[in-house]
Interface confidence: low
């Protein structure tokens, strides 16, 4: 039988009546067009919905948009279009929602051709009121909030000007012209690239990287010959053109661009690219594209300075620049990432790492699944996960993998079981231990979401036909109940729940179609009466993360420490609640070779924990460029993994000597950098 439909599944008592009393329909007085939905703030219950409708006329396109607001998690909506003077809002800019709980919202309006500048509507009270502001420029990008101060906004204009506001969009000042890309850094710093000659495209590889720490009063040029730049964790990266040819290299700074070091990564040619896959304050995952249009490259993981890199994974699937990669951070368990590799036979296989890129393995075959036609051996195969690449290829995959930091250990994804990803219709699989083991959760493709920090999982079948049934599970996907939320099926377009997975409300979005008209409709279901009591201590059980061998004293040690979590028992039907905080007890581990990455000039042979010298560097002095100085490295091949907290145990020797030689690697050294003030 299908998972969750056998006799062992206990039914949630009287759930139909409980859910019926908590199902709220809202029909939008709208012609169907597009709809976008944004949550304003955390735990506020405020949702903004923007519907837009385009009518192509002979000479021009006529557009109409409506704005709706809910303050009860989507149960009821009020039309507030009059607050924005019934203005047509540009959906390509979306709704710019302020950071944290600032309550700020910026909507960018469509204006007529001859106007001097654009128009925005601003709210700082969770969209209760809006102020119309005419801009002295036409925006090219959505307004970007400073992460530190939501009153500070930046935007690029269609004329490539960099505009800044210090009073939440009331007044704007152009602080620089000829700007290609601008990003907020930490402490209200702005980084941006500028062109000197023709345009961003023409000057690619000859751009300058600038920094302002005072919102445009003064500037510092922190890099030249720039192709592009990126921020990740505490690292600032720039890809820089080489002097002699058309190759470029990554340089990295950890002091906002004052000093730079060349990253020990391969250089790339014109057709190749670098991509920061993930970054935190400890380290970065960097993808380096292979030469040629191969569709794959290599993942490297950095040391704590972002300079020395270890090869992490070969043949990593990543289609051409700006293309698709399946790289996924499993946020429900520390150190876990999932991605795809392109094998020699051109099939795609899923790989998982549990130790932040140290080792990658195939996903274990789910116990309750058979190997499919892709498997050479019907008894030996793996689970392969569908992610962004499958979605881009229009496979029958409605959603990417899902995990939430406060639903510890839970990962939900579409997949197939075999030697590689199959193009056949996938099923939905769940892991409750961060990806170590998997179970088939639902037959066929579904939309899914996590509520109440994992206390409830909700799913809707992916179908081309109208639907009126929702499925839910209170035991991490083992058993499923079905609830008919409406008599009249709707064409389903999406599930919406508040980001953070703490809510107990789910909104089902879709449209109804009749002979003459179609309308947007939402059904919001509150599961609070299904989980009728608050969870108590007895509802939780101790779980050791990353446990693979309880016999082993070092069981659960990942990156030098292990963590015990209090997790909700699958059998407990109760509310974690909005204030639920993940309870974990960390414990430091003894150091082993697994806690060290291979240092510059060393590598790990497959299935070996020892680092050995790279043959081409044997007997050579290990020297590299650091902060514009030549450094000599004395090492026995190991460097502690960034973020690794182990103590005692193995302790390899490592020493770095300053050779007192300059090495600017064609990049600006600190003394050559210039500053200027406005």
């Amino acid at each position: 039988s299908a998972p969750g439909e056998d006799e062992e599944c206990g039914r949630v008592r009287d759930f139909v009546a409980k859910l019926a009393n908590n199902t709220h329909q809202h029909v939008f007085d709208d012609l169907r067009g597009s709809v976008s939905l944004s949550w304003v703030g955390d735990s506020t219950g405020v949702i903004l919905v923007l519907t837009t409708f385009h009518v192509p006329l002979v000479i021009m396109t006529f557009g109409q948009s409506k704005l709706y607001r809910s303050e009860d998690y989507g149960k009821n909506f009020k039309d507030i279009t009059d607050l924005i003077n019934n203005t047509f809002i540009r959906t390509e800019f979306g709704m710019a929602i302020g950071p944290e709980n600032s309550g700020k919202v910026v909507l960018t309006a469509e204006v007529s051709g001859g106007s001097r500048g654009g128009r925005i509507f601003r709210s700082s009270d969770f969209a209760k009121n809006f102020v119309q502001t005419d801009l002295p420029f036409h925006p090219l990008t959505q307004m970007m909030y400073s992460p530190q101060n939501s009153d500070y906004l930046l935007a690029l204009s269609t004329e490539n000007g960099l505009w800044v506001s210090k009073n939440f969009g009331g007044k704007w000042e152009e602080i620089h012209k000829a700007v290609c890309l601008a990003k907020w850094g930490s402490d209200n710093t702005i980084f941006f690239t500028t062109y000197a000659n023709g345009s961003c495209k023409a000057d690619l590889g000859a751009l300058e990287l600038w920094r302002t720490s005072d919102l445009g009063k003064s500037f510092k040029t922190i890099g030249v010959k720039i192709y592009s730049f990126g921020l990740g964790g505490r690292f600032l990266f720039a890809s820089v053109m080489a002097d002699k040819d058309t190759t470029r290299r990554i340089h990295v700074s950890t002091d906002q661009g004052d000093t730079w070091s060349m990253a020990q990564l391969p250089s790339v040619g014109q057709e190749q690219f670098y991509s920061i896959l993930a970054a935190n304050d400890d380290m970065v995952f960097m993808h380096v594209d292979e030469p040629g249009d191969t569709g794959f490259g290599t993942i490297f993981t950095s040391d704590d300075r972002g300079i020395v890199y270890s090869k992490s994974l070969d043949r990593h699937l990543y289609t051409t620049t700006g293309g698709e990669t399946d790289f996924t951070n499993v946020t429900s368990l520390r150190g876990v990432y999932i991605t795809s590799v392109l094998s020699e036979d051109n099939s795609i296989q899923t790989m998982i790492t549990f130790d932040q890129g140290g080792r990658w393995t195939h996903l274990r075959k789910p116990e309750n699944s058979e190997c499919d036609a892709t498997a050479k051996n019907k008894n030996e195969c793996s689970l392969h996960i569908h992610a962004s690449y499958s979605i881009s290829q229009k496979l029958n995959v409605p959603m990417a993998p899902l995990s939430e930091p406060n639903a510890v250990g839970i990962v939900i994804a579409h997949g197939s079981v075999g030697d590689a990803i199959s193009v056949m219709v996938p099923d939905v699989y769940i892991s409750d231990d961060g990806g170590y083991s998997w179970t088939k959760m639902l037959e066929g493709p579904h939309y899914y979401t996590i509520l109440d920090s994992g206390g409830i999982i909700v799913a809707i079948e992916h179908s081309s036909r109208p639907i009126n049934v929702i499925k839910f599970s209170t035991d991490e996907g083992q058993c499923w109940q079905t609830y008919t939320f409406t008599r009249d099926p709707i064409y389903f377009t999406g599930l919406a729940s508040e980001p953070g997975a703490r809510s107990m409300n789910i909104s089902i979005w879709g449209f109804t179609e009749s002979f003459l008209t179609s309308q947007w409709v939402s059904y919001t279901i509150d599961f609070k009466d299904i989980l009728e009591r608050n969870c108590e201590e007895k509802d939780y059980t101790i779980w050791l993360a990353h446990s693979t061998d309880p016999e082993d004293y070092e069981d659960g040690c990942i990156l030098g420490y292990k963590e015990q979590f209090l997790r909700l028992r699958k059998s407990s039907v109760c509310q974690n609640g909005r204030d639920y905080v993940v309870t974990k007890q960390p414990s430091i581990c003894l150091c082993s070779l697994e806690d060290f990455l291979c240092d510059f000039g060393y590598y790990r042979p497959e299935n070996d924990s020892k680092c050995v010298e790279q043959p081409e560097l044997k007997g050579h002095d290990l020297e590299f460029c650091l902060y514009g100085r030549e450094e000599h490295l004395t090492t026995n091949g190991y460097r502690k993994i960034p973020g690794d907290k182990c103590q005692g145990g193995v302790n390899p020797v490592r020493e770095v000597k300053d050779l007192k030689k300059k090495c600017t690697s064609n990049f600006l050294s600190p003394e050559k950098q210039n500053s200027k003030s406005n």
Epitope: P550, E551, Y553, Q564, S587, I588, G648
Partner: antibody, heavy 121, light 109 residues
């Protein structure tokens, strides 16, 4: 009540053998690593040997390696220490102790009352 | 091999006083794997502290543990008559699996 009860100690000549037993009660025996720790007269504590919950992994102090064998019978909730080629310096009170729970080292939280082994001619 | 050295060898104090016992490791020890035991004459040892600072079940709160790296301390805030005994620190390492300190004898002054 969680309890460990050692038996099998006694007087033995150098080069002789002895088998100690430890009967466990009041907890799920197979879930815990178990140890033998000894204390020579008037001296401090010395760890002798350890065994994992399933019995699949065993560990020994250098001083007893090759002479002592630790084992367990989870169906009988009993831990054993087979001692051979005994020496005068093996004279001590031998304690059976419970190791940490699964996943964490939480110290040796349960100790038996000890059994005395005397190696003398 | 990690060697644990306890000091002082003997500590003479009166009831009501504060006792501070030290345990120094020859190399860094993970605080998760350091424990303290109390042993009274003719009795088996009893676990007091594990993970360097966590009190075992039933241990009064006058006993506290602290430290990291190579230096660890057991503190008895206010000595009771039943606290006079021998105290051992212990670490779980790689080889040998466990090592104990030589002990500190806490006696009545």
């Amino acid at each position: 009540e969680v309890q460990l009860l050692e038996s099998g100690g006694g007087l033995v000549q150098p080069g002789g053998s002895l088998r100690l037993s430890c009967a466990a009660s009041g907890f799920t025996f197979s879930s815990y690593a178990m140890n033998w720790v000894r204390q020579a007269p008037g001296k401090g504590l010395e760890w002798v040997s350890a065994i994992s919950g399933s019995g699949g992994s065993t560990y020994y102090a250098d001083s007893v390696k090759g002479r002592f064998t630790i084992s367990r019978d989870n169906s009988k909730n009993t831990l054993y220490l087979q001692m051979s080629s005994l020496r005068a310096e093996d004279t001590a009170v031998y304690y059976c102790t419970r190791g940490r729970g699964i996943g964490y080292y939480n110290g040796m939280d349960v100790w038996g009352q000890g059994t005395t082994v005397t190696v003398s001619s | 091999e990690i060697v644990l050295t306890q000091s002082p060898g003997t500590l003479s104090l009166s009831p009501g006083e504060r006792a501070t016992l030290s345990c120094r490791a020859s190399q860094s020890v993970s605080s998760s794997y350091l424990a303290w035991y109390q042993q009274k004459p003719g009795q088996a040892p009893r676990l007091l502290i594990y993970g360097a600072s966590s009190r075992a079940t039933g241990i009064p709160d006058r006993f506290s543990g602290s430290g990291s790296g190579t230096d660890f301390t057991l503190t008895i805030s206010r000595l009771e008559p039943e606290d006079f005994a021998v105290y051992y620190c212990q670490q779980y390492g790689s080889s040998p699996m466990y090592t104990f300190g030589q002990g500190t004898k806490l006696e009545i002054k």
